[in-house]
Amino acid sequence: VPDKTVRWCAVSEHEATKCQSFRDHMKSVIPSDGPSVACVKKASYLDCIRAIAANEADAVTLDAGLVYDAYLAPNNLKPVVAEFYGSKEDPQTFYYAVAVVKKDSGFQMNQLRGKKSCHTGLGRSAGWNIPIGLLYCDLPEPRKPLEKAVANFFSGSCAPCADGTDFPQLCQLCPGCGCSTLNQYFGYSGAFKCLKDGAGDVAFVKHSTIFENLANKADRDQYELLCLDNTRKPVDEYKDCHLAQVPSHTVVARSMGGKEDLIWELLNQAQEHFGKDKSKEFQLFSSPHGKDLLFKDSAHGFLKVPPRMDAKMYLGYEYVTAIRNLREGTCPEAPTDECKPVKWCALSHHERLKCDEWSVNSVGKIECVSAETTEDCIAKIMNGEADAMSLDGGFVYIAGKCGLVPVLAENYNKSDNCEDTPEAGYFAIAVVKKSASDLTWDNLKGKKSCHTAVGRTAGWNIPMGLLYNKINHCRFDEFFSEGCAPGSKKDSSLCKLCMGSGLNLCEPNNKEGYYGYTGAFRCLVEKGDVAFVKHQTVPQNTGGKNPDPWAKNLNEKDYELLCLDGTRKPVEEYANCHLARAPNHAVVTRKDKEACVHKILRQQQHLFGSNVTDCSGNFCLFRSETKDLLFRDDTVCLAKLHDRNTYEKYLGEEYVKAVGNLRKCSTSSLLEACTFRRP
């Protein structure tokens, strides 16, 4: 019988008492084969973290700063359940740390030196740790003691709880630096008042502070937020302009064998029976013998943290950067106006080899990081382990939902002004063998399908989106008799046709021979009835253009396109017979890397782009013999996006809507994790 006990860690006598009450009340409402609570008492949160890591306890609820400690080796804990605030309809699990300024003050984030600052309190998250952590490498050296460095950075501050004797500048705007509400500039409202009164130029608070202190929109419009990209935004655009997104209070558990499903089962049942307004005799979110015992008193319930989400992703890049800077106190030696090498994310060993060759030729401008799937790469870019990669539109959508931005677009047509003219897109098509003359768009049910990969534009999102509108369910593996759609569940019929050996079968990378455009076409040639690819795929792999044994004798005339009206047309008539127009592949990165990625990639394409004529004797960025490694092989250049610099603007309303509709069919664990952070 599996042990269904969750050992909860308590950090005080009062918590232990509430834990015992929690245990007893859960016993009374949950069947004997359901989850149960046991209580473990430790002296501190750090002791609880160590106990969970050592398998002496299973769960504890932590503030964001401690979630970071819990994640660090050797603890390796992960977030499993989040408390939420507000209503069930609009649950808030995060708050945003922001920098508020007056509208007419005219400076940006990178011009804070010499300004006057208002903080909620020394050592507090939104008011100190996050802003000072993010500004850490701009502080004058020596950076220790930190208070002295901050005092020398700003021309005056109010940082309640600071030592006014040793660091008088930190108390210049609020004499005495009192550490309670007796100091009018203490806490969130106090820091905002410090700005409002004109004592300071910037207040470091949370996003709700301004709304709680100014009910009138006209008053709020006198203020703006400083964004990390050195722009400003209105105060209600905090989701796109903040210093960090911070989880409020989170249950953590072991990453391996951490009982996360059991913890969720326990807490979900607990909130049903003892949540807000559920029971008089025991209340989960109430602390008669103290404050915030086990859970925050202000919490309204729990939400399960998606399993794909580790602590780094949950806390977010900005928060982790700020806390790491403060804890480790290390800053890059390079001058900040110089671009560091761009860490390119390469999928599996084929891409890694090409990336390595690029790295050698770039003489240090490009470095390479490997991952097994596109989603793993996106996650690495999110958390700073990698910086950039080029993505199909379907993954540009996921990357965008995860906070990344497009920087340059692949262009596939030769033109005089290639780099300045991003194209409208390419065509997603359905290809069949000419010999299968009875096959049309209307009778694909039961046929064998070949897809570039799950989540990609031409191979999945467009054809499956159209199919979904017809069949109104997500069981595509039942619609087709079998197929190869790399990235599907291994036991799915949509992996049956794939050719990868062993663990590589149906993997969404080049270790699976039927992956990508060329792979999906090969799947059609060798096993399938229909392939969902781009309009250039057939000509690129026929007429001897692909020398691989399976392709060298193929003839374009032996293939036809399925049109949505039920007719068929020759391959060259793709403009009048396609499923939809697809946005070109695009390079994505984090917002903070946007300028450097743009600059370095433009330099790199001038050195190694399509202007290089002899690819046998020189490195060519856009060539890999039909394998589309790092970039599509038919890329002519990487083009500026001009104002299409967000994923929505880049992909276009129609495509975003189409992918949005398919979301209910999504198996993307990363998309689930990212929409948890930003619904």
Epitope: H350, L353, V360, N361, S616, N618, F619, E625, L629
Partner: nanobody, 117 residues
């Protein structure tokens, strides 16, 4: 694709030196980029150093200042001079030439380098 063969490995004490050679069966004059990789037991294969046709070189951070890559197009050979060797340099060392543009994962036998006292 030219055939490549590595040699020059051996057992050496920490602080010692070795020179690895990579001999090509055909001309390497037109090969765009050549490189040395290494693979320690239980670890991923990693790029150590690379050299372009024009002689530009690039090194992984942990070997910068200790290792030097060079190529002699006349002798159709590439070299890796390894000085101040450390125990963590212990691995099988492979050379590659990327020339096919297929980026297939084909590797020779490699040459074993062991740094131990």
């Amino acid at each position: 694709q030219v055939k490549l063969e590595e040699s020059g490995g051996g057992l050496v004490q920490p602080g010692g030196s070795l020179r690895l050679s990579c001999a090509a069966s055909g001309s390497i004059f037109s090969i765009a980029t050549m490189a040395w990789y290494r693979q320690a037991p239980g670890k991923q294969r990693e790029l150590v150093a690379g050299i372009t046709r024009s002689g530009s070189t690039n090194y992984r951070d942990s070997v910068k200042g200790r290792f030097t890559i060079s190529r002699d197009n006349a002798k159709n050979t590439m070299y890796l001079q390894m000085n101040s060797l450390k125990p963590e340099d212990t691995a099988v060392y492979y050379c590659t030439d990327y020339s096919s543009r297929y980026y297939h994962d084909y590797w020779g036998q490699g040459t074993q380098v062991t740094v131990s006292s």
